[in-house]
């Protein structure tokens, strides 16, 4: 079963429809107004806690404060992903959770926050001044990262206050594109509202073809529209420390950065409401520099703690490439 957000999309006026432009002038400001109001700067918070029971055991909690839907979370230590950090865990809202030593237990706490327990023994165990970073790839905001560590004087059992995004970095493709559209939309909205004050609203004629058209409609993209505007959904583009960079670029690597998204993914209702439905097939992978891969395929999407998958219309194995960090 596919669950997709019902996002208003303007329907072009039907042929021969009287008063269509007037109606559209009324619909457009509301759509733009909604976008303007909901468009806020997303934020990532990180909380690091040393467990009182095991002095070298840490719990890292991270969350995403944004309206977009999360497509991938990467937790690293030793600095941000682009500055020598090492991947500890990768959490995909539908495909699963992959953790690497010394991570012990990574899990989704809610649809927009995760937690990770690090085990406290061995050469690779963390020390008190270790920096932990969380990166959230989301649609439409792009990729956002924040880091945090324990304050030097922390007592065991105490936690550092949540760090709200000291190292916020957004992928330009996601951020600038959407911000530009929203800025333009807001300016256009103001322009429309000013014009609207100075002239009477046009009289609407009932449609001869359909009593509801044109109207803001929920958009469930057809196969054709998916094929024409397919875009993968995980957009992480920074890497771990170069010496251990887990990178793979199947079939020439990511050539999709400029693509425009065509789907709006739904926001899950939290762990209690996460459904269990079939999984997409293997195939159609998109390479991301940590060796993380987003997958799509022909099977219906699985909504774990999760989001809508964007299937590749070319079918499974169209861009087969493996997962570097599972």
């Amino acid at each position: 079963m596919r669950t997709e957000a019902q996002v208003p999309a303007l329907q072009p006026p039907e042929p021969g429809l009287e008063g269509a432009m007037g109606h559209r002038t009324l619909v457009l400001p509301w759509v733009l107004l909604t976008l303007c109001v909901t468009a806020g700067t997303p934020e990532v918070w990180v909380q690091v806690r040393m467990e009182a029971t095991e002095l070298s055991s840490f719990t890292i909690r991270c969350g995403f404060l944004g309206s977009g839907s999360i497509s991938l979370v990467t937790v690293s230590w030793g600095g941000p992903n682009g500055a020598g950090g090492t991947t500890l865990a990768v959490l995909h809202p539908e495909r699963g959770i992959r953790q690497w030593a010394p991570a012990r237990q990574a899990r989704w706490e809610t649809q927009s926050s995760i937690s990770l327990i690090l085990e406290g023994s061995g050469a690779s165990s963390p020390c008190a001044n270790t920096t932990f970073c969380c990166k959230f790839a989301s649609f439409p905001e792009g990729s956002w990262e924040a880091c945090g560590s324990l304050p030097p004087s922390s007592d065991p059992g105490l936690s550092a206050p949540p760090t709200p995004a000291p190292i916020l970095r957004a992928d330009l493709a996601g951020i600038l594109g959407v911000s530009g559209v929203l800025l333009f939309g807001c300016v256009y909205l103001l322009h429309l509202l000013r014009r609207h004050k100075h002239r009477p609203a046009p009289r609407l004629q009932p449609s001869r073809t359909s009593p509801q058209a044109p109207r803001a409609r929920a958009w469930a993209p057809s196969q054709a529209s998916q094929a024409a505007l397919h875009v993968p959904y995980a957009t992480i583009n920074t890497s771990c420390r170069p010496a251990t960079l887990d990178t793979a670029h199947p079939h020439g690597g990511p050539s999709w950065w400029a693509s425009l998204p065509t789907h709006a993914a739904h926001r899950p209702q939290g762990p209690a409401a996460w459904a269990s439905t079939p999984i997409p097939a293997r195939g159609s992978f998109v390479s991301v520099e940590n060796g993380l891969y987003a997958q799509a395929g022909e099977r219906p999407p699985h909504t774990g703690p999760g989001l809508t998958l964007f299937p590749d219309p070319r079918g499974p194995r169209a861009m087969e490439g493996p997962l570097g960090v599972r």
């Epitope: 690497w100 420390r241 887990d246 699985h302 493996p322 997962l323 570097g324």
Partner: antibody, heavy 118, light 107 residues
Framework: EVKLVESGGGLVQPGGSLKLSCVAS????????MSWVRQTPEKRLELVAD????????YYSDTVKGRFTISRDNAKNTLYLQMSSLKSEDTAMYYC???????????WGQGTLVTVSA | DIQMTQSSSSFSVSLGDRVTITCKAS??????LAWYQQKPGNAPRLLIS???SLETGVPSRFSGSGSGKNYTLSITSLQTEDVGTYYC?????????FGGGTNLEIK
Amino acid sequence: EVKLVESGGGLVQPGGSLKLSCVASGFTFNTYIMSWVRQTPEKRLELVADISNSGGNTYYSDTVKGRFTISRDNAKNTLYLQMSSLKSEDTAMYYCARPDNWDPFVYWGQGTLVTVSA
Amino acid sequence: DIQMTQSSSSFSVSLGDRVTITCKASEDIYARLAWYQQKPGNAPRLLISGATSLETGVPSRFSGSGSGKNYTLSITSLQTEDVGTYYCQQHWSTPWTFGGGTNLEIK
């Protein structure tokens, strides 16, 4: 055709060492996570270790942590498992396996038998 | 780690029977469950992933179902070649873990 061929198994005394190899062909080796899975004489399956595509990240089960080392040579399309301080409970058939991305183990080798006995 | 439990370790069945093998996870695995078939002397063979999706070449008499913690593998009409041991495996959260296996033998 994807092919995984293990070697290096044999009889070893407790406390001894052994190095298993797995030669991969039919796919781009350096773009896949690779794993070692073992099957005990009681027929239980256990993920022993796995390694990310570049070798930069590893996972070990608690039962082998500190004794086994997984590594890979991407130039030779080969996966390794260095086993030391072997115990009788390490006796098993060791399989080299390749998961497909987030999906489970689609490809398996034929296995190599490791027997730890005095 | 997530524990996987297959309640029956062995089944004695007749050819043509409908067989149901169950698997229970210690926590929700969001339908990220695989089923493998293993015949003596061979490596396991993946039959189903994602709880319901049949792998290429797997006969349609095999089917998978379930959600949350509880999953089922069904064989509608047992054939001679279906004899062997069946394992479930969660692929939601690493380390991926296997059930203890269910052996099917002919009566």
